[in-house]
Interface confidence: medium
């Protein structure tokens, strides 16, 4: 048997708690909040849980809340891309899925969410404080990444809220420009929220999912929970990492493009340039655009295998390969 704890999600107060009128007056703020969070800045949510039956078994679920089409999803562990993370799986919507030990099963749950089952023993076994990261490359938003982990004290069978580990990028004018259109709405939202500050605040409560709901949806936090704002990322150092991560190539199985530590000298020097900021509290969700090149034309290393499934006139290249989807 497996117990599951849902990610805490901000929910509007129920009519019975506040009255029908109070609920109606908060509709606009919540709509605006959702717009402010999702329209201009796509989000990535990550959820990690440990199986009750196997202490070394993890399930990672990730989803992308954005309007663009997903071109690639990379799941890594040991830290975010560019901070020593190692690729566990790469999923391409058309070209297939590649996974590497100790990943056991990677699959698409919906068009915008994936799941990955990890199990291992010994050096390649994950443990409770391992950080798992998901990076979604989408068009036109770019690449967005978020990380999550189980705290060391987590009971088996419980899922943990995402542990944010964003990597903010410079040169976001295009994306931020879209977000700017919503600036007035967001300001108005804050104004409305301030006006309603005398009312009971929305409660943090588990997301409720009907048994008939799609599995992926059950794992996706409500969009309102995306209110945690983007913050620059301070490198996470997990005490539990696969032994093979000490090398430049994580070969529990065939793999490609294992990420290596970023050279500080090549971190982008922009408004979002790698500032060290405390990681937000549990229950927050973050994602970061890091798919655009920095102004200097440099990009920190990121995890994610190479892929190729394009038809090739030179011969019958296979769909998948040990160094990446082919």
């Amino acid at each position: 048997m497996r117990t599951e704890a849902q990610v805490p999600a901000l929910q509007p107060p129920e009519p019975g708690l506040e009255g029908a009128m109070g609920h109606r007056t908060l509709v606009l703020p919540w709509v605006l909040l959702t717009l402010c969070v999702t329209a201009g800045t796509p989000e990535v949510w990550v959820q990690v849980r440990m199986e009750a039956t196997e202490l070394s078994s993890f399930t990672i679920r990730c989803g992308f809340l954005g309007s663009g089409s997903i071109s690639l999803v990379t799941v890594s562990w040991g830290g975010p891309n560019g901070a020593g993370g190692t690729t566990l799986a790469v999923l391409h919507p058309e070209r297939g899925i590649r996974q590497w030990a100790p990943a056991r099963q990677a699959r698409w749950e919906t068009q915008s969410s994936i799941s990955l089952i990890l199990e291992g023993s010994g050096a390649s076994s994950p443990c409770a404080n391992t950080t798992f990261c998901c990076k979604f490359a989408s068009f036109p938003e770019g690449s967005w990444e978020a990380c999550g982990s189980l705290p060391p004290s987590s009971d088996p069978g419980l899922s943990a809220p995402p542990t944010p580990a964003p990597i903010l990028r410079a040169d976001l004018a295009g994306i931020l420009g879209v977000s700017g259109v919503l600036l007035f709405g967001c300001v108005y939202l804050l104004h409305l929220l301030r006006r309603h500050k005398h009312r009971p605040a929305p409660r943090l409560q588990p997301s409720r999912t009907s048994p008939q709901a799609p599995r992926a949806r059950a794992w996706a936090p409500s969009q309102a929970s995306q209110a945690a704002l983007h913050v620059p990322y301070a490198t996470i150092n997990t005490s539990c990492r696969p032994a093979t991560l000490d090398t430049a190539h994580p070969h529990g199985g065939p793999s490609w493009w294992a990420s290596l530590p970023t050279h500080a000298a090549h971190r982008p020097q922009g408004p979002a340039a790698w500032a060290s900021t405390p990681i937000p509290a549990r229950g927050s969700f973050v994602s970061v655009e890091n798919g655009l090149y920095a102004q200097a034309g440099e990009r920190p290393p990121h995890t994610g295998p190479g892929l190729t499934l394009f038809p090739d006139p030179r011969g019958p290249r296979a769909m998948e390969g040990p160094l990446g989807v082919r």
């Epitope: 891309n81 490359a137 190539h249 065939p254 994610g304 190729t308 394009f310 390969g321 040990p322 160094l323």
Partner: antibody, heavy 120, light 113 residues
Framework: QVQLVQSGAEVRRPGSSVRVSCKPS????????FTWVRQAPGQGLEWMGG????????NRAQNLQDRLTITADESTTTVHMDLTSLRSEDTAVYYC?????????????WGQGTLVTVSS | DIVMTQTPLSLPVIPGEPASISCRSS????????????LDWYLQKPGQSPQLLIY???HRASGVPDRFSGSGSGTDFTLKISRVEAEDVGVYYC?????????FGGGTKVEIK
Amino acid sequence: QVQLVQSGAEVRRPGSSVRVSCKPSGGTFGTYAFTWVRQAPGQGLEWMGGITPISATINRAQNLQDRLTITADESTTTVHMDLTSLRSEDTAVYYCARGFEYSDGLLDDWGQGTLVTVSS
Amino acid sequence: DIVMTQTPLSLPVIPGEPASISCRSSQSLFYSDDGNTYLDWYLQKPGQSPQLLIYRLSHRASGVPDRFSGSGSGTDFTLKISRVEAEDVGVYYCMQHMEFPLTFGGGTKVEIK
């Protein structure tokens, strides 16, 4: 066939740095993997590392990871290889190779090579 | 790391005659998930950059004459030239891309007798 044009020969002192650039003459820049391979005089081929610009992914040989930086400049569709703390044993011809569409191990197209001489 | 060992180191050939180069890997390059063997062959002609000849064990790259063929399985591989021509001289390298780091064989120098 797409040509990979590399920057010219370099002479460097030990302890200094060098940058070698690689620019494809045509084709799509972002969807290919670019790999750097070097060849010391009279020796065989040694894989150094590579980058896949579309996913911003990089890998490097373990013995070079502290000195090697590989970057891609989308605006100029140029891949750069920076090697720091040069030693005499870094004297070699440095090749840029490109793999077919997201490929990683297939070195389909090669640059003409750049000779880097490290000498005091 | 996967170690690639090529033999012979040098191969004198007679134009029109067949030639064969062997390559051995320290571990299997066969990937059961897709049935492919991740071994490539490259030729570096004198004074030139390497060029891809054979990829994934047996597939000829674009423009490569059909006198070149690759075969083998697991850890033992062979590049064959059915009829050597003068333009085939150079150093032949096998390379594995089963896993990182990518590794090359030491090379086999083919020269006309």
